[in-house]
């Protein structure tokens, strides 16, 4: 009989995750609710003990007896300033037992007190049970992860929690180390590598810098904010909508716990939606005093609401670099961990800080730590099946996969060397007013322009209702399964109408040799590709800005707010630029940028005058960062920033 598998557990502050390595690959295991992460919550009621989703779902009804954040207590003394500070924010009671903190709750009519290790052991028991339900046999061996900054006391307490849960803890490993293992960064064979792990979770933010040399991991520096995470972003949304509800309905819902809880759940859902779409809707029936609350929020507004929080994530990055005595150019790999790193703005800030460096994000960010822990568990169990050492070099997409957007640009949804299976979704839009359909052309390759890449297939999504350019939202999903079969789906979000294509390995795909040749060619052409990409990007930015400005001043809502002279000035300049663009599609980047700056010089003072004090966009609020445009024949699809 085959040896029982060992599991990897990411014991998180707000959510936990479990994975197992079997049949040559890691499987992240879903719980009985179908969720691949489980809330690190334990609730005590008059009749039962609840763990995970069930516990979190009833938190608003039973706050004093629902325990979370045990990770903030584990291995700490009661007098620890962290404990004293955190206690002020918890609805449950923390008591002092010989300078050890204990959580006091009412359970089955009695007062009970539990050590943090006991609470964590309950969460670990749940994770163990999730794995056992999936594997069909008892599990005892596990690798459990902890933050890199955890001291010996915190590590030992976590190990004790594992033992209490009936686990044989093979090893306690650092969360950033696990994430690096997940990406195979310990097996690149390229000598010493500096890896920065950016872990933005539900309630905590950790930055770690590791040096990996010949499979040896050394933590060089850690930094972060123990109270920054997805929940803070949810709070910003909740506050925003509480204020919106006040404005619309002249009622304050903030003191109604049930209404706020329902709003928070909707906000969390909206936040997740905004990572893949540029707009999210909230529909809450009878939110307060019988009033239905139907509203929406754009990604741009969400980014604005959280801008200071997002920007603040770079301070610990800088601190970690200083502490590690490294320059940002010396970081070889950037790894994203934690669900909040799905937020495009967070990714952009980090990528821009590192001057455009690629981010390792192909593994689900809230699963990366458990993934690495599962790999480590398999290694420690001496698993040689499918050669666990080479596991991570096997299942990758050998070339970037994407589609053609306006101007013949290759827009990659799945980057080369992404671990598969993987699924990526992006929102696109139309290029022309009243465009009835879009042509989805799927390519693989590393070149900037699709004409230099390999066409895998094409299909059309028709029946798009008439709308101005840039308004329709076409959701395109690239989904590669474990066998390398690619499914591309396009859905018009307004109608739900969809079309898809399936591309298998043997249909129009490239051989190993061709892939190798294309990779080498791509290196050779990188410089000229970059020039071309920048040129098209500058052209698209100019075109977008011109059309945005034109439609902005033509907006009926601005009647009486803008003088005819100013309106004419903007429209004349837009006309000049748009006509110039039509005649100069092959102009240089400098020329496009010059025209954009010229147009901004005319428009920005006029537009900003309209929005000063109006809560709308500030100077250049309709900015050059609008939908990217381009030229091309046929129904063109356009990327949405």
């Amino acid at each position: 009989m085959a040896k029982a598998a060992a599991i990897g557990i990411d014991l998180g502050t707000t959510y936990s995750c479990v994975g197992v390595f079997q049949h040559g690959k890691v499987e992240i295991i879903a719980n009985d609710q179908g969720n691949r992460t489980t809330p690190s919550y334990v609730a005590f009621t008059d009749t039962e003990r609840l763990i995970g989703d069930a516990a979190k779902n009833q938190v608003a009804l039973n706050p004093q007896n629902t325990v979370f954040d045990a990770k903030r207590l584990i291995g700490r003394k009661f007098g620890d300033p962290v404990v004293q500070s955190d206690m002020k924010h918890w609805p449950f009671q923390v008591i002092n037992d010989g300078d050890k903190p204990k959580v006091q709750v009412s359970y089955k009519g009695e007062t009970k007190a539990f050590y943090p290790e006991e609470i964590s052991s309950m969460v670990l028991t749940k994770m163990k049970e999730i794995a056992e339900a999936y594997l069909g046999y008892p599990v005892t061996n596990a690798v459990i992860t902890v933050p890199a900054y955890f001291n010996d006391s915190q590590r030992q307490a976590t190990k004790d929690a594992g033992v209490i849960a009936g686990l044989n803890v093979l090893r306690i490993i650092n969360e950033p180390t696990a994430a690096a293992i997940a990406y195979g960064l310990d097996r690149t064979g390229k000598g010493e590598r500096n890896v920065l792990i950016f872990d933005l979770g539900g309630g905590t933010f950790d930055v770690s810098i590791l040096t990996i040399d010949d499979g040896i991991f050394e933590v060089k520096a850690t930094a972060g904010d123990t109270h920054l995470g997805g929940e803070d972003f949810d709070n910003r949304l909740v506050n925003h909508f509480v204020e919106e509800f006040k404005r619309k309905h002249k009622k304050d819902i903030s003191q109604n716990k049930r209404a706020v809880r329902r709003l928070r759940t909707a906000c969390e859902r909206a936040k997740r939606t905004l990572s893949s779409s540029t707009q999210a809707s909230l529909e809450i029936d009878s939110l307060f005093e019988g009033i239905d609350f139907y509203t929406s929020i754009t990604r741009a507004r969400f980014e604005e609401l959280c801008s200071d929080l997002f920007r603040s994530t770079l301070e610990p990055v800088e601190k970690a670099l200083r502490d590690a005595k490294l320059d940002k150019a010396q970081i070889h790999d950037l790894v994203l961990v934690g669900g909040s790193t799905r937020i495009p703005k967070v990714q952009k800030l980090l990528q821009d800080f590192f001057n455009g460096r690629d981010l390792n994000k192909s593994i689900n960010p809230d699963e990366a730590v458990a993934y690495g822990a599962a790999v480590q568990a398999a290694i420690l169990m001496g698993d040689k099946s499918e050669n666990v050492q080479d596991l991570l070099l096997l299942d990758v997409a050998p070339l970037s996969l994407g589609l053609e957007t306006a101007g013949g640009v290759m827009t990659a949804l799945i980057k080369r060397n992404s671990t598969i299976p993987t699924k990526q979704t992006q929102i696109f839009t139309t290029y022309s007013d009243n465009q009835p359909g879009v042509l989805i052309q799927v390519y693989e390759g590393e070149r900037a322009m699709t004409k230099d890449n390999n066409l895998l297939g094409r299909f059309e999504l028709s029946g798009i209702p008439p709308a101005p350019r840039g308004v329709p939202q076409i959701e395109v999903t690239f989904d590669i399964d474990a066998n390398g079969i690619l499914n591309v789906t396009a859905t018009d979000k307004s109608t739900g109408k969809a079309n898809k294509i399936t591309i298998t390995n043997d249909k129009g795909r490239l051989s190993k040799e061709e892939i190798e040749r294309m990779v080498q060619e791509a290196e050779k052409y990188k410089a000229e590709d970059e020039v071309q990409r920048e040129r098209v990007s500058a052209k698209n930015a100019l075109e977008s800005y011109a059309f945005n400005m034109k439609s902005a001043v033509e907006d009926e809502g601005l009647k009486g707010k803008i003088s005819e002279a100013d309106k004419k000035k903007v429209l004349d300049k837009c006309q000049e630029v748009i006509s110039w663009l039509d005649a100069n599609t092959l102009a240089e980047k400098d020329e496009f940028e010059h025209k954009r700056k010229e147009l901004e010089q005319v428009c920005n003072p006029i537009i900003s005058g309209l929005y000063q004090g109006a809560g709308g966009p500030g100077p250049g609020g309709f900015g050059a960062q609008g939908p990217k445009g381009g030229s091309g024949s046929g129904p063109t699809i356009e990327e949405v920033d």
Epitope: Q575, S579, W580, D582, K597, E600, Q601, P619, G620
Partner: antibody
């Protein structure tokens, strides 16, 4: 009335830097771009580039990329042109010129002499 | 980049006579949407800053005497001074703003 007043003549040694200022008055500074034009002794006009006074984004002509920097201080309605690593062939009169759709108002020019 | 070639380099004309200056562009300066040619003319007197005379090929800047006129389209443009006056002695430059900006080499106008 609209005026662009430039800083006085400068004499510099090769390798040094110079910063020419151009103070605008009589109009809203951030509503119009500011161009810089060079005229070497006995030569024609050369467009160096311009700065978007609203966003602060500069544009440099090909021959003026690298050692030249355009900046603005909107609080004083002043545009600046800095030139580093001066060479003898940088000796010229430097003009600032307001730009709407044409260069309609010009500064009086600043003579920069580079001599060892 | 667009190159503007002015001719002649210098020109001596009697007072009251007509002076004609040409400016040839390496590419068309006509924007078909606005139907404008993005060419301007500047006058620079000795020791002074340049002064705008004409923009969009033929539109006179306010305060410029009507003896100055501009014409042309596409790549060929002309500045005409109908009846030369003593105060018209200067160097005249054409400038394009179709894409980025460039000046012509200048034409020196003197009294014969």
């Amino acid at each position: 009335q609209i005026q662009l007043v430039q800083s006085g003549a400068e004499v510099k040694k090769p390798g040094a830097s110079v910063k020419v200022s151009c103070k605008a008055s009589g109009y809203t500074f951030t509503n119009y771009g500011m161009n810089w034009v060079r005229q070497a002794p006995g030569q024609g006009l050369e467009w160096m580039g311009w700065i978007n006074t609203y966003t602060g984004e500069p544009t440099y002509a090909d021959d003026f990329k690298g050692r030249f920097t355009f900046t603005t201080d909107t609080s004083t309605s002043t545009a600046y042109m800095e030139l580093r690593s001066l060479r003898s062939d940088d000796t010229a009169v430097y003009f600032c010129a307001r730009y709407d759709h044409v260069m309609d108002y010009w500064g009086q020019g600043t003579l920069v002499t580079v001599s060892s | 980049e667009i190159v503007l070639t002015q001719s002649p380099d210098s020109l001596a004309v009697s007072l009251g006579e007509r002076a004609t200056i040409n400016c040839k562009s390496s590419q068309s300066l006509l924007n078909s949407g606005t139907r404008k040619n993005y060419l301007a003319w500047y006058q620079q007197k000795a020791g002074q800053s340049p002064k705008l005379l004409i923009y969009w090929t033929s539109t006179r800047e306010s305060g410029v005497p009507d003896r100055f006129s501009g014409s042309g389209s596409g790549t060929d443009f002309t500045l005409t001074i109908d009846s030369l006056q003593a105060e018209d002695v200067a160097v005249y430059y054409c400038k394009q703003s179709y894409t980025l900006y460039t000046f012509g080499g200048g034409t020196k106008v003197e009294i014969k």
